[in-house]
């Protein structure tokens, strides 16, 4: 790895994906963006859902798709595990439907490895919160 080749991993420059437990990525991401600026633009459209608070894992999950983890040790980006995807989807899909939208095809959970192992590396993410969802209405002015 001491060769003068192109650096394999790049620092994450997307503010909402910093301080999530890993700090480097490599584009293209898992939905095909070549640039972090383009990934950030798409990520921002999920802000209402993140603010709604349907899943504490949502932000980590989205970041793992749009800026997957990179390590100098292996040549492929490490995205989310299918289990985390399903957990987030279970909690957030009903909220998306309230907004009038379906779960995005780009976040289809079958695209991701079911679990992290030597053959298919993926991120399990922070622990899932198995508590009842509080009843929330779509975000009103002034709500944080």
């Amino acid at each position: 790895f001491g060769d003068e080749e192109e650096r394999r991993c790049d620092p994450i420059r997307i503010s909402m994906c910093q301080n999530l437990g890993y700090n480097v990525t490599k584009m293209p991401n898992l939905v095909g963006h070549e640039l972090q600026t383009d990934a950030e633009l798409q990520l921002t459209t999920f802000t209402p859902l993140i603010q709604y608070g349907c899943s504490s894992q949502l932000q980590f999950f989205l970041c793992s798709v749009y800026v997957p983890m990179c390590t100098e040790k292996i040549n492929i980006p490490i995205g989310p595990c299918g289990g985390m995807c399903l957990s987030v989807k279970r909690r957030c899909e009903p909220v998306l439907k309230e907004f009038g939208f379906a779960w995005p095809e780009s976040l289809n959970c079958s695209k991701f490895p079911p679990q992290n192992d030597h053959n298919h590396m993926c991120m399990e993410g922070p622990g899932d919160e198995e508590v009842p969802l509080p009843h929330k209405t779509p975000i009103q002015p002034g709500e944080e």
Partner: antibody, heavy 118, light 110 residues
Framework: EVQLVESGGGLVQPGGSLRLSCAAS????????MHWVRQAPGKGLEWVAS????????YYADSVKGRFTISADTSKNTAYLQMNSLRAEDTAVYYC???????????WGQGTLVTVSS | DIQMTQSPSSLSASVGDRVTITCRAS??????VAWYQQKPGKAPKLLIY???SLYSGVPSRFSGSRSGTDFTLTISSLQPEDFATYYC????????????FGQGTKVEIK
Amino acid sequence: EVQLVESGGGLVQPGGSLRLSCAASGFNISYYYMHWVRQAPGKGLEWVASIYSYYGYTYYADSVKGRFTISADTSKNTAYLQMNSLRAEDTAVYYCARSSFSWAMDYWGQGTLVTVSS
Amino acid sequence: DIQMTQSPSSLSASVGDRVTITCRASQSVSSAVAWYQQKPGKAPKLLIYSASSLYSGVPSRFSGSRSGTDFTLTISSLQPEDFATYYCQQHPWSGGYLITFGQGTKVEIK
């Protein structure tokens, strides 16, 4: 209920200025892209400008860059379009719209007519 | 800049007809394309987003599809309330932020 209400349209002379307002209710504009889209009489839709106040992003169509300014007052939950150096070709109905997931503009206001004429 | 060329500009059809409207992107784009319906004096209404996803509350006779740089809106069986103007819209994906609409297709009664 989500609602967008535009105001501020009217008759203005070429070279003049006008400020349009888009009052939003039922959601927090901070977390959504807010857009201005216009439609000249008998013509199609033309995107004018967008703002994402949560991150302070603003974007403009080339045809209005340097003349129009989009802004938002999140405490009033209102988006604005300041239009300067108006031209006859800016005559149109101006719509305010919001978008989030997949960029789709899911809610639109009723529109406000801007007429630039001497 | 990406251009969205919409065709036809107008068409005449009867109730019950199958209607197809196409938008061609001038270069490769993502599936971030939406379709809107607009009636005279009214604001546009969202029908389809992400090229093929039906927006909530929109009748299932409306559908969207993609083939390469061609995006298609299909109305499987035209209803009286469907006579209107339809617009495609390309959303930002890469290479900067620029929203472009197609020129519109007016669907009239034959």
